[in-house]
Structure formats: C-alpha cells, structure tokens
C-alpha cells in the first residue's frame, strides 16, 4: 500500500522535511503532490512526468519544494504555514490511480521560561496566588512542577490561559513548595528556575500527646503540646483553668487520683496574633477498669455502612485485644485495626458480620474481657424463593407454596394470583386444586426498615394432561469446536420423567453428551457440524406423555481448506481458464481471488478468456466466514504454454 512517511514528523522552523514515499507502484505515468488531504488542482504543489522527467509547478508551489524521481518531496526552509497534510497522487492510467496522505507539524524553538507571581507571602485560607509562565509562546504546551512532581489533582489548583497561569485558591501550608514551569513543543522543551512559596499559617488546634487519658496511680504524667504554625507557636499550660507554665511540655511525676482533671494547652502565633487551645481530661485510676465496647453505628446497613468498634477506656501503655465469634480476628481487607489496636473498623458490613465481638485489656497479671457485643446488620430482602420448584400440577392435589427471602428485620410476605392480592402470609395453601387455579403466583417480600421490596413470579399450570413440552437453548448459533450448548426441557413438572431423542433415535453414548437436572437438561460440549440434528424432548408420568417439536441445531463451522477445480495446472495458450473454488462452511463463505498476490474479484468462479503465457503464476482462493470469524486459503500454480510446444497439455475450460 502506498504510504507517506514524514521525516521528521515534527519540524522546527527554518529546517527541512522529507515526505518519503513507500511502496510506489510500478509502470507509472506520473505523480503529483497537493497541499491538503485530497487531490485538488487549485492546491497542486508540483507534478512530475516520468517519461519526460519534467517537473511542473502548481498553484501551491513556493519555490522551496524539490520533487525526486522516487516521488519523495523535500520542503526546505520550513515556515509555520507549512504545517498540515500533503497528498501524493500517483497516476497510472484512466483514473485507476492511487493516493496517499502524509502530514507534519511545524514548531518554533523555545526560550527558557520564568515564573512571575502576584503574591510572595500569602496567608493560609485567605489569599490566592497566581503564577504565570513567561513568555507567552504560540503552539507551546505549558507544564507545571511542584517539588519536581507533576501537578496534583485539586479543586484549589486551576490552570488557565492555556495552562500558562497556575492559580492556587485559598492557599494552605501544603502549598509551601518549589514551583517550576516548563514550556514544550515537539521540537524543544525548556524549564524555568524554581520559585519557593512561603505560606503563613496557624496556629492549628494544638495536639496533646500521648492521646491516652487514663493513667494508673504512681505513673509519671508527661504531656507534650504541638500546633502547626508558621512562624512556630508559643505554648502555655493550664490545669483545671489555672496557669501552670509557658513550655511546650508539662511533666508531673508520681501522679495520684488528685491529679485527675482538665489539662489545657494554648498555642499562640505572634505574627497573626491568633490563639488556639485544646483540652484533654485526664483520669487517674487506682485499678484498671473493666473494658467495654462502644459503636458508632448500632444498626448498620449491608454493603453501605462501615462500623467502628472502640474498646474503652483509653489507658496508657496498654495492649488491646479483639475476638470475633470467640476467635482471634481473621485476616480480611474489610477488617482494619487502628495503630493502637483500640478501634476495630468493619468496612462495608455484610450480614455475616453480626459477631459477637469482644475486646480485652491486657495488664501485667491478666486479660480483662468486655461483655460481648452483637451487631444488628440490616439487609435484604433478597429475591424471594418460591418452593417447591414445580410448575405443573394435577387437579385434585393440594397446592402448598412457601416463600422465603433473606432479610433483617425479617421480611413481610404477600401473595398475589394473576395480580390480585390474596393474603399476607409466608405460605399459601389451596386444597383440592382445579384447572381454574392455573395462573401467575407472585410472592412479594418487603423489608419494613429499608422500605425495599422484591418479588418473584411463578407460573402454575393445573392440568390432567401433561402439556406439550418445549426446548429452550442457551446458544442458538454455536461455533464448531468452541461452544457448548445446553438444551432444557420445559416445563418443570412434579413426578415427571424426562426423555431425549436425536434424529428420532435415543441418545447415543458420547463423552460430549451430558444429562443433568433430573434429565431435564441435555448439554453438548464442543459442538461439531455433525451435531446439527433434530433434538426432541419428552415428558411422561403415570397419566400421560408428550413430546416437544424438534429443535434443529444450527452449528456454525468452517471455512475448511478450499478446493480449486478443475485440478489441472497446465494449459495451452488460447484456452479459457475457468477455476471454481469451494469450501465447506456454514454460513456460506465469501470468496476472493488473488493472482500473483494481486487482488482480483470477490466471486466463487474465476474466468479468464484466451489465456497466454502472461497468465502464468500463483492463483490463490481466499475464503472467509464472517459468522465464525475464521479464514482459509489455498494456492494453485498455473502454467500456460505456447500452443503446440508441449504435448499433453489441457485445453482449458
């Protein structure tokens, strides 16, 4: 196939580009280049006549183009306006021509960029900062780097002005970083020097560590306060509202129950004049307390809610343990323990997560267990199941249907027959049924907590005679050696025997045939074309018997390796060549011919009148089955001899 390769594809202004032609056909009259994606006399650049070796300029010729005998086009001293598509039109004869399109893009060389900023010391949660990458350059891509990484995704970061401007809205301390911009085009890339953003912030609400609030008598109390702040904060401590000291740490040795109370840390930022405080309540115990479990959600919804179970109280230097169903925690991506093991989080709870859950506090002597906690997980209703599964009943028997749908709280049930409400019970009982009881039986399950309802519909047939069965199939057009087909005999009936016939005969013994589901289902594995037969199913009980209409399996296969006829390969000059190609295939394949690799016609028969030695060569028949997606081919060599030069040659068709 004729193709154009641009070398290079992206061209710098002032340089040159070669539009290189590949697979140029033989025996040409000439060729012509056009600006754009199509042949257009008004946009011809240059033409070349092979016989006279003459180049003829066209309306789009600029004097910078050189055409070569191999049809390639060199464009020198490239300008911006040269960007775009170029079409080569190869002229053979009588408009049986070929064309191909290539393209290239023109870009300028870029200078080193720099960053300008509208605010050098922004205040957190108040100011915005706009960085602009200079200079503005046409056809350039602007990129930004934060700490030498690409920009994070954030609603506070906005690129505008063709990505030239980076705006940080409501700056935060995390925006304190090194910023660089980069200009790029396909022929060059330049990066600016870095600009450091210094954000003033804080103080935040101070954090008092350690976090535990329960201590044993006789321990040392050592509290540390920290508040994120720029510039750094100054700290003060208060115990039960009374000022203690202006330090970042508070130390009280050998505490007693009397040291219980509220401990306040105050952080102050001298630049902003802002103060923030945090209070922690410290409890000093004489003995370790019995643990108990608190939950953030007492009635979680399945597949929606997460539940966090916390072991109370919080005690310093204590090991927390957990048990589920009286066993240690299983490994599960849905179970997460906090760093101190005090909080157990169940992500996306399921109905199986009810528990019970226990936590324990380990001390030097023993492990204290909490009381067990059971989760009440709300779920369902699932799709109701109506049992038994029979759809066919004889008159006179009792009809007893039961409905069940998994649900918490338990589902409320309603029965409808042919759309009419019957009763609000889980079971439906009708004694001594008749044909009039045939119909659509609907069970509706409702969860009062979620308000969700689910229904299942079952068709019940009451008849003395067995109905005429039918065959359902899971695949109407299986592909040979690839697909399996499962036939099911409908309907499912009580106290019924199911039978199968293939082409009027009972089932052959074959490892590819399998009966299941009480002989109701017949599965054919790895179907073959020989399985394209008539399949019949039958049902019988003590009263009656019936057979389905036959179902014929339409197996898609092929195409097989084609056969070219007649088999002759030697012909006399002047004879007619009449080759026919055939391949077994379902559906029928599409045929095409190639002579010496050149595509011919899409027909089953190839006819050439009065052949000559010029017709020597390889004749290939290609077959394609669109349904199976498979292809096949065969090649035949044909030799044509001049009349009378070789005895015994075929005269042709």
């Amino acid at each position: 196939k004729l193709t154009i390769e641009s070398t290079p594809f992206n061209v710098a202004e002032g340089k040159e580009v070669l539009l290189l032609v590949h697979n140029l056909p033989q025996h040409l009259f000439g060729y012509s280049w056009y600006k754009g994606e199509r042949v257009d006399g008004n946009r011809q650049i240059i033409g070349y006549v092979i016989g006279t070796q003459q180049a003829t300029p066209g309306p789009a010729y600029s004097g910078r183009e050189i055409i070569y005998p191999n049809a390639s086009l060199l464009i020198q001293n490239i300008i911006q306006n040269d960007t775009g598509f170029y079409t080569l039109h190869v002229i053979k004869s009588d408009l049986v021509n070929e064309e191909a399109t290539g393209q290239f893009r023109v870009y300028p060389e870029l200078p080193k960029p720099s960053i300008s900023s509208n605010n050098s010391k922004p205040v957190e949660d108040k100011d915005a900062v706009a960085f602009t990458c200079e200079p503005e350059t046409q056809d350039a891509t602007y990129l930004w780097w934060v700490n030498n990484q690409s920009l994070p995704v954030s609603p506070r970061l906005q690129l505008s002005n063709g990505n030239r401007t980076l705006t940080l809205f409501n700056v935060t301390r995390n925006d304190t970083a090194s910023y660089k911009c980069e200009t790029q085009n396909p022929v060059s890339a330049r990066r600016s020097d870095s600009v450091i953003l210094n954000v003033l912030y804080g103080p935040d609400a101070p954090t008092i560590s350690p976090l535990n609030t329960s201590y044993r008598s006789g321990e040392n109390l050592n509290l540390s306060c920290h508040a994120a702040s720029n510039p750094p904060a100054q700290y003060s401590w208060f115990v039960n509202g009374t000022f203690q000291q202006s330090t970042q740490e508070l130390f009280i040795p050998n505490i007693t129950v009397n040291n219980s109370g509220s401990y306040t840390c105050q952080a102050h930022n001298s630049d902003t004049g802002l103060n923030r405080t945090t209070v922690t309540t410290i409890t000093v115990y004489a003995e370790p307390p019995k643990p108990f479990i608190t939950s953030n959600n007492s009635n979680p919804v399945e597949d929606e809610d997460a539940v966090a179970l916390t072991c109370e109280p919080e005690i310093q230097n204590t090991t927390y343990l957990w048990w589920v169903n009286n066993q240690s925690l299983p490994v599960s991506p849905r179970l997460q323990l906090s760093n101190d093991n005090r909080t157990l989080t169940l992500l996306s709870v399921t109905r199986n997560d009810v528990g019970p859950y226990e936590c324990g506090i380990q001390n030097e002597l023993s492990v204290d267990h909490s009381d067990p906690v059971i989760l009440n997980v709300l779920y369902g209703p699932d799709d109701p199941t109506i049992s038994p599964s029979y759809t066919y009943y004889r008159p006179g028997v009792n009809l007893s249907l039961s409905c069940h749908a998994a649900s918490n709280p338990p589902a409320q049930y309603s029965w409808l027959i042919d759309g009419n409400i019957q009763q609000h019970t889980q079971e439906l009982f009708i004694s001594n049924i008749t044909e009039k009881n045939s119909g659509l039986y609907t069970c509706q399950a409702n969860n009062s907590a979620s308000g969700h309802s689910r229904t299942t519909v079952k068709t019940i047939t009451v008849s003395a005679e067995l109905p005429k069965p039918s065959i359902s199939s899971n695949n109407s057009k299986p592909v040979e050696d690839k697909d399996a087909v499962a036939f099911t005999c409908e309907p499912e009936a009580q106290n019924t025997t199911y039978l199968w016939w293939v082409n009027g005969q009972s089932l052959p013994v074959s490892p590819r045939l399998q009966l299941s589901n009480g002989n109701r289902t017949l599965t054919l594995f790895n179907v073959t074309r020989n399985d394209a037969r008539a399949y019949v199913c039958g049902i019988q009980n003590s009263v009656s018997a019936n057979r389905s209409d036959p179902v014929t399996l339409d197996v898609l296969y092929g195409p097989d390796t084609p056969i070219i006829s007649p088999p002759d390969s030697s012909y006399l000059s002047g004879a007619n060549l009449n080759l026919s190609c055939h391949s077994a295939s379902n559906p029928s394949p599409q045929y095409s011919w190639r002579i010496n690799g050149i595509p011919q016609q899409h027909t089953q028969v190839l006819f050439i009148a009065k052949i000559t030695p010029n017709n020597n060569g390889t004749y290939a028949c290609f077959v394609s089955n669109l349904a199976t997606g498979r292809n096949n081919s065969i090649v035949k060599s044909i030799t044509v001899s001049a009349s009378g030069t070789s005895p015994g040659l075929s005269a042709g068709a």
Partner: antibody, heavy 116, light 106 residues
Framework: QVQLVQSGAEVKKPGASVKVSCKAS????????MHWVRQAPGQGLEWMGR????????NYNQKFKGRVTMTVDTSTSTVYMELSSLRSEDTAVYYC?????????WGQGTLVTVSS | AIRMTQSPSSFSASTGDRVTITCKAS??????VAWYQQKPGKAPKALIY???YRYSGVPSRFSGSGSGTDFTLTISSLQSEDFATYFC????????FGQGTKLEIK
C-alpha cells in the same frame, strides 16, 4: 473505463428550478472533485462550482451563489446540480467534469432550455 | 475573480498553416493554465496542462508556452481535424475560462 452519464434535456419556465444529475462509474468516486461547467448557445465555457463526494465540500462561482446547490449521493455514485430562479439567460448545455492534472473526463452534457 | 482574455475571438486559416492563439490573465497565475479544444455538439477535450505540457495522446503539433499573465497555444501545421473552438483556463484560484477562439477554414 471512466464514464460520466448525465440526465436528459429539460425545458423550464422562468423562475422555476432545474436539477441535473451526473452518474459516475469506472473510478473511485470519492477521490476527485466533480466540477459543473455550462455553455450558453454559441458562447464560451463558464465554471459554476465543484463538490467533493467524500464529504460534500463545495466551492461555488460567486456569480451563482445563492442560486446553485450541488449535492452528492455516494450510494449511487451520483452528483446533482440544482439551479433555481431560472431566467432565459440560463439556457445552456450543463456539463459535469473531472478536471485534474494530466487527465480530464466530461459528461455528454444536458441541455436546459428556459422559456415562457 | 481572475479573468482570462483570449484573442483573437475567431480566425480563418488553411490546412498546413501555423496558428497562434493568445490568452492574458488579469493577475499572475504562474504556469497554472490549461488549453481545451471543443468541436460542435461535443464536450471540451484537454490539450495542454501546466501551460506547456501535452496531455497523453495529444499530437506534437500542439504546443503551449508562457507564465505569469501571458500564455500562447500554437498549432505548428493545421490539420483538417483541428478546426474547432479553443479555450484557455486558469486553475490557480478556482477555475476561469477564456471566452474562446473559433478556428475556421479559410
């Protein structure tokens, strides 16, 4: 071989419209511009415009803008030229043509007579 | 729009004569000019492209020359089948034809 077959002669009253068809065969229909050229009796050739069958892109002679519409039906490889608000000076033979570097093909022409 | 002015509008000549037809463009069109021959009741037939190059199958007695705004079609030795109307055409900016030169038998 390349053939451009045009529709038959038409007689129209002033103010009416005429639609001439040009059915192409023997080449890749969507590769080349189709031009329309007219020739009044005893007069020279006048280029009316062109259409590209691949995307129905058109260029019209300013003289005919607003009166001429060129369309294409790729399913039948046919190009149409419709001229509206006909006047007596529109009486001419209308040709469709493929005119490119080193080759040209013309239809047989369609005589349109405008007479009251 | 570019105008193409052709001269003469008609010309009488004899078989064997050398005939020259000229065409002038209203602006520079480079060498983007073609010449056509038309016989009565027939569609035009292209003779010359790019001002001076013969189409395949056109006899060598037909030649073209010129560039910019002035163009010439020359028939070196008139044959009986050459009596027809000749048109120049520019394809530098869309398409414009000259008004034609009718070549008649003297």
């Amino acid at each position: 071989q390349v053939q451009l077959v045009q529709s038959g002669a038409e007689v129209k009253k002033p103010g009416a419209s005429v639609k001439v068809s040009c059915k192409a065969s023997g080449y890749t229909f969507t590769s080349y511009w189709m031009h329309w050229v007219r020739q009044a009796p005893g007069q020279g050739l006048e280029w009316m415009g062109r259409i590209h069958p691949s995307d129905s892109d058109t260029n019209y002679n300013q003289k005919f803008k607003g009166r001429v519409t060129m369309t294409v039906d790729t399913s039948t490889s046919t190009v149409y030229m419709e001229l509206s608000s006909l006047r007596s000076e529109d009486t001419a033979v209308y040709y469709c043509a493929i005119v490119e570097w080193m080759f040209d093909y013309w239809g047989q022409g369609t005589l349109v007579t405008v007479s009251s | 729009a570019i105008r193409m002015t052709q001269s003469p509008s008609s010309f009488s000549a004899s078989t064997g004569d050398r005939v020259t037809i000229t065409c002038k463009a209203s602006q520079n069109v480079g060498t983007n000019v073609a010449w056509y021959q038309q016989k009565p009741g027939k569609a035009p037939k292209a003779l010359i492209y790019s001002a001076s190059y013969r189409y395949s199958g056109v006899p060598s007695r037909f030649s073209g020359s010129g560039s910019g705004t002035d163009f010439t079609l020359t028939i070196s030795s008139l044959q009986s089948e050459d009596f027809a109307t000749y048109f120049c055409q520019q394809y530098y900016s869309y398409f414009t034809f000259g008004q034609g030169t009718k070549l008649e038998i003297k």
